[in-house]
């Protein structure tokens, strides 16, 4: 079940996503797009990012934190009704099978007549998630020296999303092990 | 040693279902994700189907989305496909595979041969 | 999906001389915070399943005769068969794992001149 955020007509919608670079400058290429995160990209791109910058981008879809933080959450500017439904957050962590994917519920309301806030994030406490990793048996000799160095916050009102997420998973299966903290 | 033995190959005619197995030996399945491959007669490789090792996130190609549906029974330390709907273009040779950290195909099944014909 | 293309579909060589593969990738497969190419090749033999030969671009997998090597970054890589066997003949295959599903280059053939 998806997190559900609410924005109302003519004013800005926010849909946080964010991850943590293992260092300054240690970037994931993430895309944002509209409709449910598929099995692989993100479908009906509406922003893209790379190891370095904003490499596409449509008009009204910004991104207006730092995403070179690993802030990639989405602002949509001066929405309209058409702009309810879900839309894909995926941090694409190289490797096989190995994305973090966030599907975002939008929903439009119509505008009151007093003024609202420009922008609500109907969200919780954030959790971080802390990788460390362990060795494999004596069959294996690559190291995980070659995964990607990454911690992942993931914001969520979900504790079990958490739990069944890709990375948690993906990480299990590569022989590291998963602190939430 | 890590051992990838497999089974359930056949002929089966067009819209017909097939289930696939590979059972693992010298590793522990569930610390590993897994894949299916397959190749057309005479044909290259092509990536089907993976899962985590874990069983609870899957992924499919295009090609047979909504079709094969992979899965796994860790305490056999056994891996499945389950192919529905068959159609011809899906003849091949399908191979599981062990999918070393997130990364390359480092263990093979022998294969196993699916004729789809009526 | 990342497109991997191969160069030539077929290679003749004469024992003991050098066997050159090509792999280009329709996007950069180097991921530059880590600075690895996530890119393998595979050997396949008449009848058995595909063998990994060498991860990461370069790195041998363990048993591998040094006589496998690979090379390149970014978009285009090669592997190189320094002194042909007659064991070597095969298939080989490039593959990426950086991103989308994994995909495979179509193959070449390597034989005996």
């Known amino acids: 079940s998806e997190v559900e955020y609410r924005a109302e007509v003519g004013q800005n919608a926010y849909l946080p996503c964010f991850y943590t670079p293992a260092a300054p400058g240690n970037l994931v290429p993430v895309c944002w797009g509209k409709g449910a995160c598929p099995a692989f990209e993100c479908g009906n791109v509406v922003l893209r990012t790379d190891e370095r910058d904003v490499n596409y981008w449509t008009s009204r879809y910004w991104l207006n934190g730092d995403f070179r933080k690993g802030d990639v959450s989405l602002t949509i500017e001066n929405v309209t009704l058409a702009d309810s439904g879900i839309y894909c957050c995926r941090i694409q962590i190289p490797g096989i099978m190995n994305d973090e994917k966030f599907n975002l519920k939008l929903v439009i309301k119509p505008a009151k007549v007093t003024p609202a806030p420009t922008r609500q994030r109907d969200f919780t406490a954030a959790f971080p998630r802390m990788l460390t990793t362990r060795g494999h048996g004596p069959a294996e000799t690559q190291t995980l020296g070659s995964l990607p160095d990454i911690n992942l916050t993931q914001i969520s009102t979900l504790a079990n999303e958490l739990r069944d997420s890709r990375l948690a998973n993906d990480l299990r299966d590569s022989g590291a092990t998963i602190r939430i903290g | 040693q890590v051992q990838l033995q497999q089974s359930g190959g056949g002929l089966v005619q067009p819209g017909g279902s097939l289930r696939l197995s590979c059972a693992a030996s010298g590793f522990t399945l569930s610390s590993y994700a897994m894949s299916w491959v397959r190749q057309a007669p005479g044909k290259g490789l092509e990536w089907v189907s993976g899962?985590?090792?874990?069983?609870?996130?899957?992924y499919n190609a295009d090609s047979v989305k909504g079709r094969f549906t992979i899965s796994r029974d860790n305490s056999k330390n056994t891996l499945f496909l389950q192919m529905n709907s068959l159609r011809a273009e899906d003849t091949a040779v399908y191979y599981c595979?062990?999918?070393?950290?997130?990364?390359?195909?480092?263990?093979w099944g022998q294969g196993t041969l699916v004729t789809v014909s009526s | 999906e990342i497109v991997m293309t191969q160069s030539p579909d077929s290679l003749a060589v004469s024992l003991g001389e050098r066997a050159t593969i090509n792999c280009k990738s329709s996007?950069?497969?180097?991921?530059?915070?880590?600075?690895?190419?996530?890119l393998a090749w595979y050997q396949q033999k008449p009848g058995q399943p595909p063998k990994l030969l060498i991860y990461?671009?370069?790195t041998r997998e363990s048993g591998v005769p040094n006589r496998f090597s690979g090379s390149g970054s970014g978009t285009d890589f090669t592997l190189t068969i320094s002194s042909l066997q007659a064991e070597d003949v095969a298939v080989y295959y490039c593959?990426?794992?950086?991103?989308?599903?994994?995909?495979f280059g179509q193959g070449t053939k390597v034989e005996i001149k």
């Open positions: 595979a062990k999918i070393f950290g997130s990364y390359y195909f480092d263990y």
């Open positions: 593959q990426q794992y950086y991103s989308g599903p994994p995909t």
């Open positions: 990461w671009t370069s």
């Open positions: 899962i985590s090792g874990s069983g609870g996130s899957t």
């Open positions: 996007q950069s497969v180097l991921y530059s915070s880590n600075n690895k190419n996530y």
